[in-house]
């Protein structure tokens, strides 16, 4: 029996499905205009040439005109995600066009088969778009496509495929099998539009990565390292998703980078930063909270477009659920030991104290390890605003916390069993804040006591005299 | 108004084959998924599967799988349920009813339902 | 597949008073913020009749005396007050992004 094909070629070919009794010739791309925030309301189709629906559904020339772009489904049907975007942008913009690109029968295939429907999907884009240019007011400069996974590949098509530039694509965890490393042509790149940024959220070191591990964009965007995801780990997925499995984490990871997009959108108040940096080691050692030299920018819808910069990569830490913002804190700390204990490798912890509130015990994470009689620079974030930064505490976890720092004490203790007591003098601690880019210098209250072994404490407040205090003579304060 | 209107029950023995419509009304046939869920005499409800209704690509649930067939005339504004190789377990009550691509998923309008007997 | 359990399988609640009926999932239902939970009513020889989405909203038509509640894997729906026409069996149903999506065993509720 016919089935459905358009200009794209025959959908029954593409599907590998029972064929339906149909008879009609249908396209098998669908752009649905969502013309209310209600999820359940069935909006209006448009198709290429009929004018008439434009009328009907109130479509805005002069407005922005978004186009969402699903990827690969195992389901067949729209992921709830797709409601949230869409309601999120028309809180955000009322006036705009929001417009759901359905091509879930292409969609709805084995992988490798959806990736071979992404070019005639971004054919489909670039020919609707072609045809709205015809119209009076219309401009290409207020289109941005948002696609997520193979979605954001189907948009760098339309992108590339358009008379003309479009304004902006946002790439949401574009996918990462069979994209990785090919030909910008094939795949999401600068080239695609005006601007194109990207969310990077689930993009695996090893094995295979459902996320783009390479930088596709002007800027690319990679929360938490691009990798592993706050609130997403098996015991978090566990106790609140549907489905308490891998395929869940994997999920969970991979769709973050929609709810970060949500998240710019209707948390304005309260924006995230992400700071470029030339890996995640690098950024997890705090080495990268400058704003300098456009080095920062805002993740999600409200990104500063940055046309100089191609495949700058950029990094941030985010809390598990929405609103994601959190406060990062660059740490300056010059470790000095009179007992040249090499192998020492405290596990520190320290606590903010500010004005509108303090923070948890934060850890200072060692990424590589502690260089003694140098200064060691580490990252820490609160989810809170802590306001002006007034005192802290370092703290040295004692020998019982843990089983680890009991073997490592063990260790050290056989490494060095002449000199069982350890020591480190710390004299000052510089903080930057990366969100104020204020920078302050905090001393020890007691410059006399500036000690401290496993189990003690350490308090550090503003110094006196600010940046100068600096004494020549002092093996403490070698400050890079 | 919106409608879902199935065809009138049938008796069938076992092997035989059935095959149940569900015209749909007072609405855009291909903007809405439809349903198949049934129900055995005394017992609970039982989700099918589903068919997009523009497409024409089925989902069928596990245990539905081979002698079920979900199909549509789209210019008719009519799904089908075709049932092969009828068991007596078959018989039971089948209902169709639609849900919102857009929305969260949830059954808002039902046909009557198609009661079906299959018995030697 | 996840797994409804209703409880209770029957009751019967005077005219008047308050009909509490209780739906357990094996997994959450929630999916950022929201509880893909439906509930429907069905009387003998009739389809069932949409009451309760997404959890805690209201169906068209249907008459506030119709509630529901809840989140994660418990969800709870309220008749109140009673009357003769809610004598019927409801039905609790998930609708998560991931399919199969699967009905609850039912609850018949009986007017007094």
């Known amino acids: 029996s016919p089935v459905p094909f358009g200009p794209e070629g025959r959908l029954e070919d593409k599907l590998h499905k029972p064929k339906a009794t149909q008879t009609e010739v249908k396209p098998s791309v669908r752009f649905n205009l969502r013309t209310s925030k209600d999820p359940e309301h069935e909006g209006c189709y448009l198709s290429v040439g009929h004018s008439q629906p434009l009328e009907d559904c109130s479509f805005n020339m002069t407005a922005k005109t978004f186009f969402i772009i699903h990827g690969w489904t195992m389901s067949g049907i729209f992921e709830n995600w797709l409601h949230k975007l869409v309601s999120a942008l028309h809180t955000r913009e009322k006036d705009a066009n929001v417009v759901v690109v359905d091509w879930l029968p292409l969609a709805h295939q084995l992988y490798t088969d959806a990736v071979n429907n992404t070019r005639v999907v971004g054919h489909s884009i670039a020919r609707m778009l072609d045809w709205l240019q015809e119209k009076d007011d219309f401009s290409l400069g207020n289109v941005h496509l948002i696609g997520y996974s193979l979605g954001a590949h189907v948009a760098g098509y339309a992108g590339n495929f358009v008379k003309g530039t479009v304004g902006r694509i946002t790439g949401l965890d574009p996918a990462g099998p069979m994209f990785e490393g090919v030909d910008i042509n094939r795949r999401l790149s600068p080239d695609d539009a005006d601007f194109v940024d990207v969310l990077h959220t689930y993009t695996l070191s090893f094995g295979l990565s459902i996320g783009i591990r390479m930088p596709v964009g002007h800027i690319d965007i990679y929360p938490n390292g691009g990798d592993f995801q706050p609130g997403c780990g098996f015991n978090d997925v566990i106790g609140s998703f549907a489905y308490g499995t891998i395929s869940e984490m994997v999920k969970c990871e991979h769709e973050r980078a929609v709810h970060l997009f949500v998240d710019s959108l209707v948390n304005q108040d309260k924006p995230s930063f992400a700071f470029q940096c030339t890996d995640s080691s690098r950024f997890k050692r705090g080495i990268c909270l400058s704003c300098r030299k456009n080095r920062c920018n805002n993740i999600g819808y409200n990104a500063k477009k940055m046309r100089k910069k191609r495949n700058s990569k950029m990094y941030l830490k985010t809390r598990a659920g929405m609103p994601f913002k959190v406060y990062h804190y660059q740490l300056k700390v010059h470790m000095f030991s009179y007992n040249n204990s090499g192998d020492t490798q405290p596990t520190l912890y320290i606590t903010l104290y500010g004005s509108n509130a303090d923070s948890q015990n934060l850890p200072l994470e060692i990424v590589e390890k502690i260089e003694l009689n140098a200064t060691n620079t580490f990252l820490v974030y609160t989810e809170e605003d802590l306001g002006d930064l007034l005192k802290m505490r370092l703290t040295w976890e004692g020998v019982a916390h843990s089983w680890y720092n009991l073997w490592n004490e063990f260790r050290n203790y056989l490494s060095q069993p002449s000199n069982p007591s350890r020591e480190l003098y710390i004299r000052r601690i510089r903080v930057k804040s990366g969100e104020t880019q204020r920078k302050v210098t905090f001393c020890t209250q007691d410059p006399t006591k500036s000690s401290i072994s496993p189990g003690q404490e350490l308090w550090f407040h503003k110094c006196q005299d600010g940046w100068k205090m600096k004494n020549k003579t002092s093996p403490f304060v070698n400050l890079a | 108004q919106i409608q879902l209107v199935q065809s009138g029950p049938e008796l069938k023995k076992p092997g035989e084959t059935v095959k149940i419509s569900c015209k749909a009304s007072?609405?855009?046939?291909?903007?809405?998924?439809m349903n198949w869920v049934k129900q055995a005499p005394g017992k609970d409800l039982k989700w099918m599967g589903w068919i997009n209704t523009y497409s024409g690509v089925p989902t069928y649930a596990d245990d539905f799988k081979g002698r079920f067939a979900f199909s549509l005339e789209t210019s008719a504004s009519t799904a089908y349920l075709q049932i092969n190789n009828l068991k007596n377990e078959d018989t039971a009550t089948y209902f169709c009813?639609?849900?919102?691509?857009?929305?969260?998923?949830?059954?808002?309008?039902w046909g009557q339902g198609t009661t079906l007997t299959v018995s030697s | 597949d996840i797994v409804l359990t209703q409880s209770p399988a029957s009751l019967a609640v005077s005219l008047g008073q308050r009909a509490t009926i209780s739906c357990k999932a094996s997994?959450?239902?929630?999916?950022?913020?929201?509880?893909?939970m439906n509930w429907y009513q069905q009387k003998p020889g009739q389809p069932p009749q949409l009451l309760i989405y997404?959890?805690?909203n209201l169906g068209s038509g249907i008459p506030a005396r119709f509630s529901g509640s809840g989140s994660g894997t418990d969800f709870t729906l309220n008749i109140h007050p009673v009357e003769e026409e809610d004598a019927a069996t409801y039905y609790c149903?998930?609708?998560?992004?991931?399919?199969?999506?699967?009905f609850g065993g039912g609850t018949k509720l009986e007017i007094k």
């Open positions: 149903h998930q609708s998560t992004d991931d399919p199969p999506w699967t």
């Open positions: 997404a959890a805690s």
């Open positions: 997994q959450s239902v929630d999916y950022d913020g929201d509880s893909y």
């Open positions: 007072g609405y855009t046939f291909t903007n809405y998924g």
């Open positions: 009813a639609r849900f919102s691509y857009y929305g969260r998923h949830y059954f808002d309008y």
